[in-house]
């Protein structure tokens, strides 16, 4: 076509893959009648008719564009749907009257690549390699046109550097026409790169402008020789008996050497190898004071057979010995005095405390507890706690029972029990004293006695309710070498269906749910209600 060289540059239309390109025929009215236009695609300088407009009506030509073209904007614009990378070419419209003129449109197609996928070299890199080794591979799939890749180490872009950094990129075209970019970073690394963070960045363009996508950050296994081995103890800080203690060897090389942990025998002063678990960790569980001592670690490089020894580390497992209380089983008269002394050994300064066992009340801060003018109520348990204040949880205790000589003392003097005739009744009677009392009943039945504590006894009696028993009631008598004491249980008939738990009562009562005589092996349970004050 004459004068084609002077034609203006084609109009640029940019569009993303998969969207619709609007190709507007830019011929003026003077240049041609838009109701009579031919549309061509130009590929490798070859024109192909793809669409024709006659009297404002459009018609696709058979071929690759046949299904994707339509006319818009009263015939001035050709719409190309489902754009692909192969559509990146020049389209031109040619007016036929009054004379043949054409208008060229350059279609540019774009597609953002997928998130870059980074894979580190799983074999790792030795620091003493002669030339750059493969560090990682970055793959950016399905982009168009080919994106640019930039590698970063610790947030700084890496540049090609002779014998130090080499970036090797290649791309493949998918059947879709999209590009997959593969970039391999090769580098010579040093020991300090063991913690370095590498990532790749893809730079690409869209109609909206320039964009970029970053891969995740990766670290690369870096291999370097061991220069130093040392011991580490967990938990850090003060250790105590009962703790789980882990002693592990550490080295500044990668891979680490083969470790062994030894403890100095205090008698022979020889280092004796300890048995470690599969991970080379010496686990002391539970730790005991005997585990205290001097430990050291040996690291053996199995490649070079070079052996390195750690600095010895002193391990102290803090302890509190068994607590001893004297006297161990004190017996005293009422009104006398008693001095309880607590002793224990420890690796640290000890604090002593005396507590009343029954209430937990702190009676004394110190190893000696002095009890004056002892009353019956002073009998019972006293606990000495020996603790190390600087190490929470490190303590041992010892319970001592103080016995105050005295005649039996009843839990109650009198009690009313509601019963039904021919029931098997389960009665209980409790007494305390020192020496510990024994309990007898004034009626025949199955009695059993159990010691509640060194000064207290509980007797239970299973008995059949008979008219005679209702008449006489039941007495339990507790006796020891200092005297005897009696409790009386008055039995009263009741209709069980009328007895409710909250029925009002003015006397000290106890209810018994009882079983019929036919179930003589079952027992009832007593529910205590307020008791008389006098306890004898």
């Amino acid at each position: 076509v004459p004068g084609e060289a002077e034609q203006p540059a084609p109009e640029l239309v940019e569009v993303e893959v998969g969207s619709t390109a609007l190709l507007k025929c830019g011929l003026s009215q003077s240049q041609g009648n838009l109701s009579h236009v031919d549309w061509f695609s130009v590929h490798k300088e070859k024109r192909t008719l793809i669409f024709r407009v006659r009297q404002g009506q459009g018609q696709s030509e058979p071929g690759e564009y046949e299904q994707r073209l339509s006319l818009q904007d009263r015939g001035a614009t050709l719409a190309l749907t489902q754009v692909t990378p192969q559509d990146e070419r020049i389209f031109l419209c040619q007016g036929k009257r009054p004379r043949s003129q054409e208008y060229r449109i350059q279609l540019r197609v774009y597609k953002a690549p997928e998130e870059p996928n980074i894979q580190v070299n799983p074999l790792g890199i030795p620091v003493n390699s002669k030339e750059p080794e493969e560090v990682a591979t970055c793959v950016g799939r399905n982009g168009y046109p080919i994106p640019q890749v930039i590698w970063y180490k610790n947030g700084r872009p890496l540049k090609e550097e002779k014998n130090r950094v080499h970036i090797q990129s290649s791309q493949t075209v998918e059947s879709s026409g999209l590009y997959t970019l593969q970039s391999i970073l090769k580098a010579q690394l040093v020991k300090e790169d063991k913690d370095a963070q590498f990532y790749c960045e893809l730079n690409y363009r869209l109609p909206s402008g320039n964009h970029m996508k970053e891969s995740r950050e990766v670290t690369v296994p870096v291999f370097y020789p061991t220069e130093k081995v040392w011991l580490e103890v967990e938990p850090v800080g003060m250790l105590k008996e009962g703790d789980r203690v882990e002693i592990r060897c550490l080295a500044d090389g990668n891979p680490p050497p083969h470790f062994s942990i030894s403890k100095q025998n205090p008698s022979t002063r020889e280092a004796e190898e300890e048995t470690t678990n599969d991970n080379g960790v010496l686990v002391l569980e539970p730790a005991r004071k005997e585990h205290s001592g001097r430990y050291e670690c040996q690291g053996l490089d199995l490649d070079t057979m070079i052996s390195l020894l750690s600095e010895p580390q002193e391990l102290l497992v803090n302890y509190v010995s068994d607590v001893r209380v004297s006297p161990a089983a004190p017996e005293r008269q009422e009104g006398s005095s008693l001095t309880l002394t607590c002793e224990a050994e420890s690796s640290q300064d000890l604090e002593f405390q005396w507590l009343r066992e029954e209430t937990g009340q702190v009676l004394e801060r110190g190893p000696v507890l002095q009890l004056h003018d002892l009353k019956r109520e002073a009998g019972g348990g006293y606990r000495c706690v020996a603790s190390v204040p600087s190490i929470p949880g490190l303590n041992r205790t010892q319970l001592v029972n103080v016995a105050i000589f005295g005649p039996p003392w009843m839990a109650f003097k009198e009690r009313k029990v509601w019963v039904k005739e021919n029931m098997v009744l389960n009665l209980s009677c409790e007494a305390s004293g020192h020496p510990r009392p024994t309990i007898s009943w004034n009626v025949n039945g199955t009695a059993s006695e159990q010691d509640q504590d060194p000064q207290r006894v509980l007797s239970t009696l299973n008995v059949l309710v008979t008219p005679e028993l209702l008449e006489t009631g039941v007495e339990c008598t507790a006796s020891n070498d200092l005297g005897k004491n009696t409790s009386i249980l008055f039995l009263e008939l009741v209709n069980l269906t009328t007895l409710t738990p909250d029925s009002n009562t003015t006397t000290g009562l106890s209810t018994s749910t009882a079983s019929p005589h036919t179930r003589a092996n079952s027992t009832s349970t007593e529910r205590k209600l307020p008791e008389p004050e006098s306890r004898g």
């Epitope: 017996e331 005293r332 008269q333 009422e334 009104g335 006398s336 005095s337 008693l338 004056h372 003018d373 002892l374 000589f405 005295g406 005649p407 006796s479 020891n480 070498d481 200092l482 005297g483 005897k484 004491n485 004898g536």
Partner: antibody, heavy 119, light 108 residues
């Protein structure tokens, strides 16, 4: 071996005062209650007073309440009976006595010291 | 409260004799028994339910029922001739003590 040795007895006029002492040995003095028991000539035993091991509690027969005071010095292993406003009927041999472990009754006695109240 | 004893009891040599003591306090406390020979201090012979201090022959025994305590000498010996006193806490539940009036035992 438990030993109880009384001293301080003698002749005193009615209305007068006397202080009896009892030196104890052979046992942990502070752990035991102690008593004074008296026996008038030709008569039976009469309990007079008792004191707890710590000295914190004291007990008296009605016949001597308000006139006699029992006390002890655990550092000296010694029991005392301060007798004031003495009467003729207080004439007796006064025994110092140690309670049994159990308390509440006596297991060892001294040889006694005679107190005579007479004008 | 008081403890009541028979003033005098006699027993033939080698026979068994029972000396009794009555009192309200004996419902709650066991009596202890003392032997006193002329010009000597009393000696504990039986205490508690039925206990003897070391050195006391096993012919001495004690028992209790209701408000009565008993001292039994099985096969009385001449050296058992003495005054015997029962002793108990007061029935008031305080720490006051009381002695019986004593029983003069004669061994015939």
């Amino acid at each position: 071996e438990v030993q109880l040795v009384e001293s301080g007895g003698g002749l005193v006029q009615p209305g007068g005062s006397l202080r009896l002492s009892c030196a104890a040995s052979g046992f942990t003095f502070s752990s035991y209650a102690m008593s004074w028991v008296r026996q008038a000539p030709g008569k039976g035993l009469e309990w007079v007073s008792a004191i707890s091991g710590s000295g914190g509690s004291t007990y008296y027969a009605d016949s001597v309440k308000g006139r006699f005071t029992i006390s002890r010095d655990n550092s000296k292993n010694t029991l005392y009976l301060q007798m004031n406003s003495l009467r003729a009927e207080d004439t007796a041999v006064y025994y110092c006595a140690k309670d049994h472990d159990y308390g509440g009754f006596i297991d060892y006695w001294g040889q006694g010291t005679l107190v005579t109240v007479s004008s | 409260s008081e403890l009541t004893q028979d003033p005098a009891v006699s027993v033939a040599l080698g026979q068994t004799v029972r000396i009794t003591c009555q009192g309200d306090s004996l419902r709650s406390y066991y009596a202890s028994w003392y032997q006193q020979k002329p010009g000597q201090a009393p000696v504990l012979v039986v205490f508690g339910k039925n206990n003897r201090p070391s050195g006391i022959p096993d012919r001495f025994s004690g028992s209790s029922s209701g408000n009565t305590a008993s001292l039994t000498i099985t096969g009385a010996q001449a050296e058992d001739e003495a005054d015997y006193y029962c002793h108990s806490r007061d029935s008031s539940g305080t720490h006051l003590r009381v002695f019986g009036g004593g029983t003069k035992l004669t061994v015939l």
